[in-house]
């Protein structure tokens, strides 16, 4: 199809090649175009649109994404070249920050329903660099966290530095919707819940005497709760004890739980005490079995091919571990009786 | 910095613009809006035109007011004064957030037959 | 519509005593959005407090905001001849629309 019709946004992604960071775009069709599609009312309704109205389907999903190849190529289907671009409703996700993500993206709807919706299209260029250090030293991280029922801000990592005096107005999304009140560099949030959460974009244009782009930023966003103050409790083994059948295998599951920690470096680890000796043991990785907000359940399991004679005389101990301390809890073996 | 013009007397029903002229920032990168205080009274938040070019409007507004920009110039567009819209009009950098950072001196509309 | 109620009005204080404004919001304001201006005699507003208790640039630490949801307060303590001026709470609202100032609050150094 001809895109010389579609309305053109530029935009920039400048990443910061010390964390990973995703990015999005939006398909912004031209109002009222975008509120029967993807039910997401992003501008003013005061504003005039640009285009005929767009005799669109509801359906959220409607929307096709192309790249245009910079050498001239046909467009091509994003979700038949572009693994690492992933698409969802009306947004376009890219999962991995790159140079090679630069270029010309389009969307439009996939039902073309009356001859005017042919030119309802979008084309978004998209610039990506790599941050340069001189910049800010204390700029926001892509990924931030508020803490539950306490006050925090969000800060648009492009932004974080300016003050808020001299900060551009700022478009914020959350989720995809435009949150209109807030045009600053940072929002503030009076009292964290949970609902808080979510994947944040940020946009502010700059503009020099030829043209002018919108600069965007993704900000993942977690609320959690305050760091624990208590070491890790084992769940399991509760008894010292275990009655077991001589040659036959045994497996004896280690389960603790741990508080959550914002730098999170959860030790649990087995090792056997046979009289003055001691020695860690080799066994399977340990597994996540329950994750809250407030504790993580964790699992470790030593794993015996056949009880013998000696194993009766050794005591299997359970060592856990978190930056607060260690607990452990050892188990001795016991020949079943009859 | 922001300075207003185009105040002065106006009879009633005449339209009437005033203008917003910036410099040292782009029009283009910020929010701006008007404000508006009768003679001994409060103040009046109008109107925010954003970066990109939509407006929001108070309530109590109902049609009266438009607010527009060009590359350095905002304007505000009374369409048919009445003698309450007698006041000093201000222009601010800031938004529908509240927060006006930066305030022109203002320029006084008088409407009287 | 949106209501926000200063008190009280006028209010006058001594060179280095304390004073509180408040400003009461009807509905809650949106999130802290919550501005407090000062303006004095032929000249425009001037930014204090920013979203309820954040100081703008420039303006002495003896003015503090506190507050949130429909109840706000503006305390200058240490009070100085220069802070002789009419205050001013602003609250955004959700869908804007609604956005308003508080009728203001003299306030007279003695």
């Known amino acids: 199809f001809n895109i010389s019709g579609c309305s053109t946004k530029k935009l920039l992604w400048t990443y910061s090649t010390r964390s990973e960071e995703e990015f999005v775009l939006f398909c912004d069709l031209p109002e009222p175009q975008k509120s029967h599609f993807c039910h997401r009312n992003r501008l003013s309704p005061k504003q005039v649109p640009e285009h005929l109205p767009f005799m669109g389907s509801n359906d959220l999903s409607d929307v096709q994404w192309y790249q245009q190849p910079s050498n001239g190529d046909p467009l091509e289907d994003i979700r038949k070249s572009y693994p690492h671009i992933i698409q969802d409703k009306c947004t376009l996700h890219f999962l991995t920050p790159g140079v090679n993500n630069s270029g010309s993206y389009i969307c439009r709807p996939k039902m073309i329903k009356s001859p005017y919706d042919v030119a309802c299209c979008v084309k978004m260029i998209l610039e990506v660099k790599p941050q340069t250090n001189a910049s800010c030293e204390y700029s926001a991280s892509h990924k931030q966290d508020l803490l539950l029922g306490s006050t925090g801000s969000i800060s648009c990592p492009s932004l974080s530095c300016q003050s808020d005096a001299q900060s551009p107005a700022v478009t914020w999304y959350k989720n995809g919707k435009l949150l209109s009140v807030e045009r600053s560099n940072r929002i503030v949030v009076d009292e964290v819940y949970d609902y808080h959460q979510g994947t944040y974009v940020c946009d502010y244009t700059q503009s020099d005497t030829v043209s002018s782009w919108t600069v965007r930023a993704v900000v993942q966003v977690r609320t959690i709760v305050g760091d624990t103050k208590l070491k890790p409790d084992i769940l399991d083994p509760v008894e010292d004890t275990l009655e077991v059948e001589l040659g036959k295998p045994l497996t004896i599951s280690c389960k603790a739980r741990f508080g959550f920690e914002r730098v999170f470096n959860p030790v649990i680890k087995w090792y056997i005490k046979d009289s003055d000796l001691e020695w860690e043991v080799s066994v399977p990785e340990a597994k996540s079995i329950k994750s809250t907000l407030k504790d993580e359940i964790i699992e470790r399991n030593i794993i015996l091919e056949k009880v013998t004679q000696r194993d009766l005389r050794r005591k299997f101990v359970c060592f856990v571990q978190n930056s607060i301390g260690n607990t452990t809890q050892s188990v001795q073996l016991k020949e079943k009786r009859g | 910095s922001l300075k207003e013009s185009g105040g002065g007397l106006v009879t009633p029903g005449t339209p009437l613009t005033l203008t917003c002229k910036v410099s040292g920032f782009s029009l283009s990168s910020y929010d701006m809006s008007w404000v508006r205080q009768a003679p001994g009274k409060g103040l009046e938040w109008i109107g925010t035109?954003?970066?990109?070019?939509s407006t929001y409007y108070a309530s109590w507004t109902k049609g009266r007011f438009t607010i527009s920009k060009a590359s350095t110039t905002v304007d505000l567009k009374i369409t048919s004064p009445t003698t309450e819209d007698t006041a000093t009009y201000f222009c601010?950098?800031?938004?529908?957030?509240?927060?006006?950072?930066?305030w022109g001196p203002g320029t006084l509309v008088s409407v009287s037959s | 519509a949106a209501v926000l109620t200063q008190t009280p009005s006028p209010v006058s204080a001594p060179v280095g005593g304390t004073v509180s404004i408040s400003c009461q919001s009807s509905p809650s304001v949106y999130s802290v959005y919550l501005s407090w201006y000062q303006q004095k005699p032929g000249q425009p507003p001037k930014l204090l407090i920013y979203r309820a208790s954040t100081l703008a640039s420039g303006v002495p630490s003896r003015f503090k905001g506190s507050g949130s949801g429909t109840q706000f307060t503006l305390t200058i303590s240490d009070v100085q001849c220069d802070d002789a001026a009419t205050y001013y709470c602003?609250?955004?609202?959700?869908?804007?629309?609604?956005?308003?100032f508080g009728g203001g609050t003299e306030m007279v150094v003695k």
């Open positions: 602003a609250g955004a609202y959700v869908g804007s629309s609604d956005n308003t």
């Open positions: 601010a950098r800031g938004s529908t957030n509240m927060e006006f950072w930066f």
């Open positions: 035109i954003y970066d990109g070019g």
